[in-house]
């Protein structure tokens, strides 16, 4: 309950708030959990604590880990945990699932996209906004304070939006980017960037050698009839058929279902007579539609035999 996930990109600023709240007068101590080492408060350090905030200016991949914050008052102490992950910058345009903030929905009447976490930073307008890596241009887009307004929203406006701004700390500038998906609500139905429900990203599935195994790729695409939506499996990044292993087959056709009113599809990958070499493969569940493609990777591991010793 009092643990919070935070993430950022290397060489960008990242500011994390302690998940335990307290009055401004309370002191907050920060520690790096693995070593129990205290985080300094001096601003000359690249990573330093500033009351409720933990600042990485800029962040490095090696900063990843769990940080403990203790809010101290005259009568009690409250402990919180910040699970921080710093990722390497992607060379391509795709924003991976793990860098995405919560999805927001808009409609023709209300199409505000707030820049995630921006209130933690010392920034000045204007914000820069990008959709699928392209800078947003044209009179339909208005950067207003900490949010983007889109006029005359259409279903094609759904996608991944990135805000970019500069955090200023004692005269030094640091870049920050944050991305979230935007979906368009429409009475007739709408389409959104695929959301994979299963498998989880980098899931490890336990299988028994010699037995059959099934993997299900399941994703949702929006409401109503979906255009160009599909789920499929790939092996080591190639088509199942190109891989040429007859024991591993994708089911013909995909099953349609509905979850919370959303149109979802699933596709089963069947592995007959699981072999040791199957554990070395990368199984990719792909969900795609007109907005783009999302990929979750699964690997297999050997299920340990049940220990019968007392």
């Amino acid at each position: 309950k009092f643990s919070k996930q935070s993430w950022g990109l290397e060489n960008e600023a990242l500011i994390v708030r302690c998940p335990r709240q307290g009055k401004p007068s309370y002191t907050v101590d920060w520690y790096y959990s693995q070593t129990n080492k205290s985080i300094p408060t001096q601003e000359r350090n690249r990573v330093f604590a500033s009351g409720q905030l933990l600042k990485f200016l800029p962040a490095a991949v090696a900063d990843s880990g769990i940080y403990t914050c203790i809010v101290r008052s005259p009568t009690f102490n409250r402990t919180g945990y910040a699970n921080v992950t710093i990722y390497k910058k992607q060379s391509d345009c795709n924003v991976p699932d793990y860098l995405m903030y919560s999805t927001v929905s808009g409609s023709e009447k209300n199409s505000k996209i707030y820049c995630p976490t921006i209130d933690l930073y010392n920034w000045t307008a204007p914000l820069e906004w990008f959709k699928n890596c392209q800078a947003l241009q044209g009179s339909r887009y208005r950067a207003h304070k900490s949010f983007l307004v889109i006029d005359n929203v259409m279903t094609e406006d759904a996608g991944d939006y990135t805000c970019k701004f500069i955090h200023n700390e004692n005269g030094a500038n640091y870049s920050v980017t944050a991305t979230r998906s935007f979906t368009v609500k429409d009475e007739q139905g709408f389409s959104l960037f695929p959301v994979i429900g299963a498998p989880a990203q980098n899931e490890i599935k336990e299988v028994e050698i010699g037995k059959n195994a099934n993997l299900t790729c399941s994703a949702c695409f929006g409401k109503g009839t979906q255009f160009l939506a599909a789920v499929l499996w790939q092996l080591n990044g190639t088509k199942i058929t190109d891989f040429g292993e007859p024991r591993i087959q994708q089911e013909e056709g995909q099953n349609q279902s509905f979850s919370n009113g959303l149109a979802c599809l699933d596709m089963v990958l069947r592995i007959a007579d699981v072999k040791e070499e199957d554990l070395l493969l990368q199984y990719d569940c792909l969900a795609l539609n007109l907005h783009g493609l999302r990929r979750h990777t699964v690997r297999l591991s050997r299920k340990n035999p049940i220990d019968h010793h007392s």
């Epitope: 094609e156 160009l228 599909a230 499929l232 088509k239 058929t241 087959q249 994708q250 013909e252 056709g253 995909q254 795609l288 007109l290 907005h291 783009g292 493609l293």
Partner: antibody, heavy 121, light 107 residues
Framework: QVQLVQSGAEVKKPGASVKVSCKAS????????MHWVRQAPGQGLEWMGI????????SYAQKFQGRVTMTRDTSTSTVYMELSSLRSEDTAVYYC??????????????WGQGTTVTVSS | DIQMTQSPSSLSASVGDRVTITCRAS??????LHWYQQKPGKAPKLLIY???SLQSGVPSRFSGSGSGTDFTLTISSLQPEDFATYYC?????????FGGGTKVEIK
């Protein structure tokens, strides 16, 4: 090895019909969509339509609607394309091309060798 | 119907050259674009699917990029066997349509 083998060349008179076959081997026949694409001499590629061998459903380009019929025979892993009311401008090489599901993502990755159809009086 | 316009319609290049072919769609087609190579008297061969994915068995000197309406096929270092005609094709909306082709000739 996935292969598509088409029937031999045809010479037809204007107004006649031609039926070209495309036999698939090396994969699950019903697991691949089959397109028909033609190429007139010295010209580019033109899509005619698609058949899903699994259910037999078809989609034809408007230009060929009413003149083209695509069918399949799952027992012999063969798809057929019949074009009726032939005219001289139908002279072309006709290709069958396979696409794995979903065809709009994967493109046409297996092609037959082509069947030359000549329409001449 | 969605129109696909390729440019140039032909080009002359030497072995080792970097070659770029562009394809423009008359409307947004997302990333549902494929590239093919065709040699005289032969069937086309798929090189790139979904705008940027390299088809299995195709040399890595071929690459594709772009989304929306503008797409590019790049051959990083032209080889003797690459002299052929190249076509783009959209699969966003039936009828599927091809570009007019780009003939790559020996300089």
């Amino acid at each position: 090895q996935v292969q598509l083998v088409q029937s031999g060349a045809e010479v037809k008179k204007p107004g006649a019909s031609v039926k070209v076959s495309c036999k698939a081997s090396g994969y699950t026949f019903t697991g691949q969509y089959m397109h028909w694409v033609r190429q007139a001499p010295g010209q580019g590629l033109e899509w005619m339509g698609i058949i899903n061998p699994s259910g037999g459903s078809t989609s034809y380009a408007q230009k060929f609607q009413g003149r083209v019929t695509m069918t399949r025979d799952t027992s012999t892993s063969t798809v057929y394309m019949e074009l009726s009311s032939l005219r001289s401008e139908d002279t072309a090489v006709y290709y069958c091309a396979g696409s794995y599901y979903p065809y709009y993502y994967y493109g046409m990755d297996v092609w037959g060798q082509g069947t030359t159809v000549t329409v001449s009086s | 119907d969605i129109q696909m316009t390729q440019s140039p319609s032909s080009l002359s290049a030497s072995v080792g050259d970097r070659v770029t072919i562009t394809c423009r769609a008359s409307q947004n087609i997302g990333y549902f674009l494929h590239w093919y190579q065709q040699k005289p008297g032969k069937a086309p061969k798929l090189l790139i699917y979904a705008a940027s994915s390299l088809q299995s068995g195709v040399p890595s000197r071929f690459s594709g990029s772009g989304s929306g309406t503008d797409f590019t096929l790049t051959i990083s270092s032209l080889q003797p066997e690459d002299f052929a005609t190249y076509y783009c094709q959209q699969s966003y909306s039936p009828p599927l349509t091809f570009g007019g082709g780009t003939k790559v000739e020996i300089k």
